[in-house]
């Protein structure tokens, strides 16, 4: 039978001779050279050679366990003379014995990691890992221990796990953001003579909201014209915050001051500036300076840092309202005046008043916009604003006069304003009543006395307060011996009645009746109107059949009295 144990061979042999592995030996070998040893399998004849007489095996080359830790070979012992095996072919192993010839190697040459600033000591940052190619099952060649070469006192590393942790309290990103930590991994459990490898860990402190906003100055001053419309930006302020991103976002608010209602502050969403804007219309003459207290605060606050103080800051903003030369302001938005239509030229109707609202109180002159009074019916005293007539008025021509008055600053004619004046012309009884239409009627030859032949209506251009009251009568010159009578109906109408039975058209074809119409106002106005009455032939129903031809041609022609 074969006589050997497992063969062991130290790796990385550096001797000048071949490295002795061991001896194959059969108990059938008498030492007389009759047996021949043959080697086959992994590396036989190349890496491993055998003395066929003695069975001694040698390694011809330097072996690396990390490349191949085990070689499996087969041994044969044959009788040289017969060529027959004296032992069954058998497999054996050459195990390469480890030496510490490999340093630990990190999985990454450079690690990148982040950890929030102000983290508690012992906060996990990152885990680094190094591997050693040596045999972990034998000795300490592959037992890796981690240590920190660079990065203290800020960070520490757990020797066995490679976990890097924070080691210093209150590491402040605003003070230092980047750290380069060098970690060493050493085998042999870290003992002397162990091999080592290193890696770099770039650690960035990420921002937390540990800084409040701060105004770089305690007071700001801005100017804005009083004419600035609501919404107008008038200035920018900026609180600085050492934090970044969301932690540096700032909200501005007005917390106090007389300008609380007059101004607003908004945050520029891109630049994080506070923009002071006008909220309501300003008036230099009412208030020239406003003071605001503006607060800058972080909208997102981390409660654990509140012990550092409030995450807000205040500044005073002084706003100076600048005077703008404003046009004069009339005491009313519109004026309504009245005047009797019989007013004489130069009669004063009323007055307007305008004042310069500016502090300077510049004097004002008045004028009439002639585009609104082309006929120059009215005028104005340029100094005191009195309105007076410059022509006679007639209510019946125009009841309302709508004119525009202009007030202009004497020292600055560019500054002017306008106001409408509505002048009502009041009625005076200066028109006589008249017939509403031209009256031409007829009477039948066979008419009976007291027969109504026409109803009269009157009109008057005047507009008395209590309404019209007209009276009708025959003119005095026609009253006696008239063939007709006037009956006043007392309702502003009158009737013409026949006074006799029968008329002869051949004797008198046409009658002209002068009728006096009077009003009941003061002073009484009256006029005389003529009614033409033709005498016609009629049928038994009273329908006209024929009249005198002359009367048709000259309806207003004169004839003898009615």
């Amino acid at each position: 039978s074969w006589m050997w144990n497992q063969f062991f061979l130290l790796e990385e042999y550096t001797g000048s001779d071949y490295q002795y592995v061991g001896k194959l030996h059969s108990d059938q070998d008498r030492g007389d050279g009759s047996l021949k040893y043959i080697l086959s399998g992994d590396g036989a004849g190349d890496l491993f050679i055998i003395n066929e007489n003695t069975g001694d095996i040698q390694a011809t080359k330097r072996l690396d366990r990390e490349e191949k830790p085990v070689y499996i070979l087969r041994a044969q012992a044959i009788n040289r003379r017969t060529g027959r095996p004296v032992e069954p072919e058998s497999e054996f192993i050459i195990k390469i014995h480890d030496i510490n010839d490999n340093e630990p190697i990190f999985t990454k040459e450079v690690y990148t990691a982040t950890v929030p600033e102000m983290s508690d000591v012992g906060t996990f940052v990152v885990q680094v890992t190094a591997t050693d190619a040596d045999d972990p099952t034998y000795g300490n060649s592959a037992k890796v221990v981690y240590s920190i070469l660079q990065g203290q006192p800020y960070f520490s590393v757990e020797s066995e796990t490679g976990i890097i942790k924070t080691a210093l309290l209150n590491m402040d990103r605003e003070n230092r953001e980047q750290y380069q930590v060098v970690i060493q991994a050493k085998d042999m459990g870290g003992q002397m003579g162990g091999l080592s490898g290193t890696t770099t860990v770039n650690i960035t402190l990420t921002d937390v909201n540990d800084n409040p906003p701060r105004f770089p100055q305690s007071t700001y001053q801005f100017k804005t014209p009083e004419s600035s419309p609501p919404g107008t930006p008038i200035g920018r302020i900026k609180a600085s915050d050492a934090d970044v991103g969301e932690n540096a976002e700032i909200e501005y608010s007005i917390t106090d001051g007389e300008g609380l209602d007059m101004f607003d502050v908004i945050t520029d969403q891109e630049t994080q500036e506070g923009i002071i804007t006008v909220k309501k219309l300003l008036d230099f003459e009412k208030k020239k300076v406003y003071t605001l207290k503006v607060e800058a605060s972080n909208p997102y606050v981390e409660p654990r840092f509140l012990y550092l103080g409030p995450f807000k800051d205040s500044a005073t903003v002084r706003i100076v309202v600048e005077d703008v030369d404003e046009p004069p302001v009339f005491s009313k938005l519109a004026y309504i005046l009245q005047i009797r239509e019989d007013a004489q030229i130069n009669t004063t109707i009323g007055s307007v008043t305008a004042q310069d609202p500016d502090a300077a109180r510049n004097p004002v002159k008045y004028s009439v916009d002639r585009h609104t009074d082309m006929d120059r019916i009215f005028n104005i005293d340029s100094g005191n604003g009195s309105i007076f007539t410059s022509k006679l008025l007639d209510r019946e021509t125009l009841l309302w006069h709508n004119i525009t008055v202009i007030a202009t600053e004497i020292n600055n004619p560019k500054q002017s304003s306008r106001v409408p004046l509505y002048i009502k012309v009041l009625d005076v009884n200066d028109n006589a009543p008249e017939f509403a239409e031209f009256y031409e009627t007829f009477v039948c030859e066979k008419a009976k006395a007291d027969q109504l032949i026409q109803t009269l209506h009157a009109v008057d251009k005047d507009d008395p307060y209590s309404g019209h009251q007209f009276s009708f009568s025959l003119a005095p010159e026609a009253a006696s011996g008239s063939n007709f009578t006037i009956q006043d109906n007392k309702d502003n109408t009158a009737g013409i009645l026949t006074r006799k039975n029968g008329y002869n058209r051949h004797e008198m074809s046409t009658y002209l009746l002068p009728v006096v119409i009077s009003d009941n106002d003061y002073p009484v106005q009256s006029s005389t109107g003529t009614v033409t009455v033709r005498v016609c032939a009629c049928d038994h129903h009273g329908n006209m059949q024929s009249c005198h031809a002359e009367a048709l041609i000259h309806p207003t022609g004169l004839s003898t009295g009615a």
Partner: antibody, heavy 121, light 107 residues
Framework: EVQLVESGGGLVQPGGSLRLSCAAS????????MNWVRQAPGKGLEWVGR??????????YYADSVTDRFTISRDDSKNSLYLQMNSLKTEDTAVYYC????????????WGQGTLVTVSS | DIQLTQSPSSLSASVGDRVTITCSAS???????LHWYQQKPGKSPKLLIY???YLASGVPLRFSGSGSGTDFTLTISSLQPEDFATYYC????????FGQGTKLEIK
């Protein structure tokens, strides 16, 4: 006077790409976020996306309908805004407006004249 | 995302009428973040009222805005012929959103 002039619109097939440009003038371009807004024919207004200023790392935001297909960029040295449109769909047919916000970067105060993009086969 | 719902969607009115358009937000927003726009056919939208109350430059005083939280209003006190257009509300929180629009037409 604030001026925004869009260009680059035209007819493109579904699946195709187009790049719109917007030339800005009359204001400090670097202090304003910029937006693209579109309007399909006969329809309402739809926000496409926004790009912030350098201080905010040129962060971009997009409407869900264009995310992963459209990219907004800006070149502050050229006062220019861009919209790269890829994988175009027929529903992307619209007039595209380049829009600047009001002071403080609120609202959409200044609009270009718009450029028409037609996606059709 | 914050949804904005305008009402009415369309409105017929006459010159001189007082008109009110409302904008309702699906969740509360600061008045700083709500704005109104006017758009006429074939034209770019125009900022009308910013930060809920403030009139943009050149906008007539007949326009006004109000509201807070989730309910905002645009009012035109006396309609003029040039006011017939489509009006949109918009909020500033990313993703920015617009109301669906209110078309104001001549009665």
């Amino acid at each position: 006077e604030v001026q925004l002039v869009e260009s680059g619109g035209g007819l493109v097939q579904p699946g195709g790409s187009l790049r719109l440009s917007c030339a800005a003038s009359g204001f400090t371009f670097t202090t304003y976020a910029m937006n693209w807004v579109r309007q399909a024919p006969g329809k309402g207004l739809e926000w496409v996306g926004r790009i912030r200023i350098k201080n905010n790392n040129y962060a971009t935001y997009y409407a869900d309908s264009v995310t992963d297909r459209f990219t907004i960029s800006r070149d502050d040295s050229k006062n220019s805004l861009y919209l790269q449109m890829n994988s175009l769909k027929t529903e992307d047919t619209a007039v595209y407006y380049c829009v600047r916000p009001d002071y403080g970067n609120y609202g959409l105060a200044y609009w270009g004249q718009g450029t028409l993009v037609t996606v059709s086969s | 995302d914050i949804q904005l719902t305008q009402s009415p969607s369309s409105l017929s009115a006459s010159v001189g009428d007082r008109v009110t358009i409302t904008c309702s937000a699906s969740s509360s927003i600061s008045s700083h973040y709500l704005h109104w726009y006017q758009q006429k056919p074939g034209k770019s939208p125009k900022l009308l009222i910013y930060r809920s109350f403030y009139l943009a430059s050149g906008v007539p005083l007949r326009f006004s805005g109000s509201g807070s939280g989730t309910d905002f209003t645009l009012t035109i006190s006396s309609l003029q012929p040039e006011d017939f257009a489509t009006y949109y509300c918009q909020q500033d929180i990313v993703p920015l959103t617009f109301g669906q629009g209110t078309k104001l037409e001549i009665k």
